[in-house]
């Protein structure tokens, strides 16, 4: 069984709160004396809230022509690629475009791949000056293509006490750091056999939220120097070692939203909704996330507050039983008031059956 | 022992219309797709439909579109319901399981480890 | 749509000879290709799939290759149980192609 994605890395200017608000407060990002005035101000030396970002997109096939448009359940994932899906016995195929002016890779967490797919490069016997070229499955050129495959072998799904489906997550690895700082990354979620309906989703699931909260830290992004240029106005007077310009520059997000920007955070109350939490970053991303409201249940407790590392993901069931507007957001201190908040809604809705007939 | 078996073909006058049922067993196909393809006599095979067991998620080839409808009744029971038949619509239609499959953009196709003996479909006056 | 030649539409072997059978896609459907054997009366069967790979059953003197648009069956020690039609089928799973079939090659085994 094969899951075949085709997923470009491209160019996009991303804005990190599009209503110019912050949700929670209702004032202008740029407030004087706001929590937000100082990632959103833009000035002489300072970016503000939009970048220039690498994201990974899903395209319709190998022409990277058509791209696939998000719908309503999608427009969550915001900065993060597409949701990559398999159960255990799947092989997986993604056919990668890199469209980017950077050599780009992808290297996932959690699926089993030979060298020839690794989308990390090293030299088995390191050698500095050794001039060897880096194979291609780690070092896609710009303009270029190659096509990834990743095996599900039972040894890397669910266990019976897992849940039945599992958060991991994907991203660029040629300089890792700088890579997933510039965007690239993305959800996957790897699930037991038998446990999905046709087009990915979980049974008896009714939604499936992926959050990637983090510290998006611009300055370690491969393409600062673009920022600066594109959004100061003073480019030449930028010191980028200077204290206050780097930690403006530092993003508490999630899915690359801040302060409750993020959209589609919907559901009805009585849902079946899993939340998959996945992390990554440095050691500022140490993260307790919140959900006021309602609690979920994550190996038999009942929680309200989740426990988040770099590289570490979890999956999370919640049944909300309370209608109303709510947080999600990062309790560490600086990540709540740097805007690592967002605001789900549980709807009373009428229920309706879904058609799921296609023609070819 | 895996095994399908087709029944309810048989002579239809033309623009009439027919059920036919495939019948598996020796396996549970709720994580199978279960598929009907044709074969006219003298020519190649042709896909019609498939169905997901686990879900009754459904696709169709374009030329299939409102005639043809497949409907997993049981578990271990799929239909195909035809109408508004023509004689060009005569073959003998098989059922096939897809146990070997690719997702790509939203839609799956199928290789067929599995097919049933055919039952033969004629449309004549 | 994906349409799918195969030549030629008819071949002689001779018993420990070998075959080649040639399917050619009008567009790239990667290794998403199936190869079926057919004797008159029986319905298909799978010989291969993923271009190259066999179902367990299938005897190792059928062999798959290619991929792209190019793809070949090969069958070595050619036995007279071999003598069928032979069909390839592309199932490259796409929302604008019909999973489509070659119109087959007949081996006659002497």
């Known amino acids: 069984h094969v899951r075949h994605y085709y997923i470009a890395a491209e160019e996009i200017i991303w804005n990190y709160a599009p209503s110019g608000i912050d949700i929670f407060t209702k004032e202008n990002l740029t407030a004087p004396g706001s929590d937000s005035a100082v990632f959103f101000e833009q000035g002489t030396t300072r970016i503000g809230g939009s970048y220039k970002k690498l994201v990974y997109r899903e395209y319709t096939d190998a022409s990277f022509t058509n791209r696939k448009e998000r719908g309503p359940e999608e427009e969550h994932l915001g900065i993060l690629g597409p949701v990559i899906w398999a159960e255990v016995g799947d092989t997986i195929r993604v056919t990668f475009h890199n469209k980017g002016a950077y050599p780009l890779s992808i290297e996932p967490i959690g699926v089993r791949f030979n060298k020839n797919n690794e989308g990390t490069y090293y030299s088995p016997n390191y050698n500095p000056q050794s001039r060897s070229v880096p194979p291609s499955a780690s070092h896609v050129a710009p303009t270029e293509t190659f096509t990834y495959e990743w095996t599900v072998p039972k040894e890397v799904g669910p266990t019976n006490a897992d849940p039945v489906c599992l958060a991991k997550m994907y991203y660029s690895a040629v300089e890792p750091t700088k890579d997933i700082f510039t965007g690239l990354i993305g959800p996957m979620k790897i699930c037991k056999k038998g446990s999905l309906h046709a087009n990915g989703r979980q049974k008896d699931v009714d939604k499936e939220f992926y959050l990637f909260p983090t510290v998006f830290d611009e300055n370690e992004s491969l393409l600062l120097e673009d920022n600066i240029r594109m959004f100061t106005t003073a480019p030449d007077q930028v010191d980028k070692e200077d204290e206050d310009f780097q930690e403006s520059n530092k993003m508490h997000s999630m899915n690359g939203f801040m302060y409750g920007n993020q959209p589609g955070l919907t559901m009805c109350k009585g849902d079946s909704v899993v939340w998959y939490l996945f992390s990554a970053g440095n050691e500022a991303d140490v993260h307790g996330i919140y959900f006021s409201g309602n609690t979920y249940l994550w190996r038999g407790e009942r929680r309200d507050t989740a426990n988040l590392f770099p590289q570490t993901s979890l999956t999370l069931h919640m049944w909300p039983d309370t209608e109303g507007t709510f947080n999600v957001e990062c309790l560490t201190t600086d990540h709540y008031t740097g805007g690592m908040k967002q605001k789900y809604t549980v709807n009373q809705c009428r229920r309706q059956s879904e058609d799921s007939t296609f023609y070819l | 022992q895996e095994q399908l078996v087709e029944s309810g073909g048989g002579l239809v006058q033309p623009e009439g219309s027919l059920t036919l049922t495939c019948k598996a067993s020796?396996?549970?196909?709720?994580?199978?797709?279960m598929c009907w393809v044709r074969q006219a006599p003298g020519k190649r095979p042709e896909w019609i439909a498939c169905?997901?067991?686990?879900?009754?998620?459904s696709y169709f080839a374009g030329w299939a579109k409102g005639r043809f409808t497949i409907s997993k009744t049981s578990s271990t029971t799929v239909t195909l319901q035809m109408t508004s038949l023509t004689a060009a619509d005569t073959a003998t239609y098989f059922c096939?399981?897809?146990?070997?499959?690719?997702?790509?953009?939203?839609?799956?196709?199928?290789?067929?480890?599995?097919w049933g003996p055919g039952t033969l479909v004629t449309v004549s006056s | 749509d994906i349409v799918m030649t195969q030549t030629p539409a008819s071949v002689e072997a001779a018993v420990g000879g070998s075959v080649t059978i040639k399917c050619q896609a009008s567009d790239d459907i990667y290794s998403y290709l199936a190869w079926y054997q057919q004797k008159p009366g029986q319905p298909p069967k799978l010989l291969i799939f993923d271009a190259s790979s066999l179902p367990s059953g299938v005897p190792s003197r059928f062999k798959g290759s290619g991929s792209g648009t190019q793809f070949t069956l090969t069958i070595s020690g050619v036995q007279c149980a071999d003598a069928a039609t032979y069909y390839c089928?592309?199932?490259?799973?796409?929302?604008?192609?019909?999973?489509?079939f070659g119109g087959g090659t007949e081996v006659v085994v002497k």
């Open positions: 089928q592309n199932y490259y799973g796409s929302s604008s192609s019909v999973h489509a």
């Open positions: 169905i997901y067991g686990g879900d009754g998620t």
């Open positions: 096939a399981r897809a146990d070997y499959y690719v997702y790509v953009d939203g839609g799956y196709g199928h290789a067929y480890d599995l």
């Open positions: 020796g396996f549970d196909f709720s994580s199978y797709w």
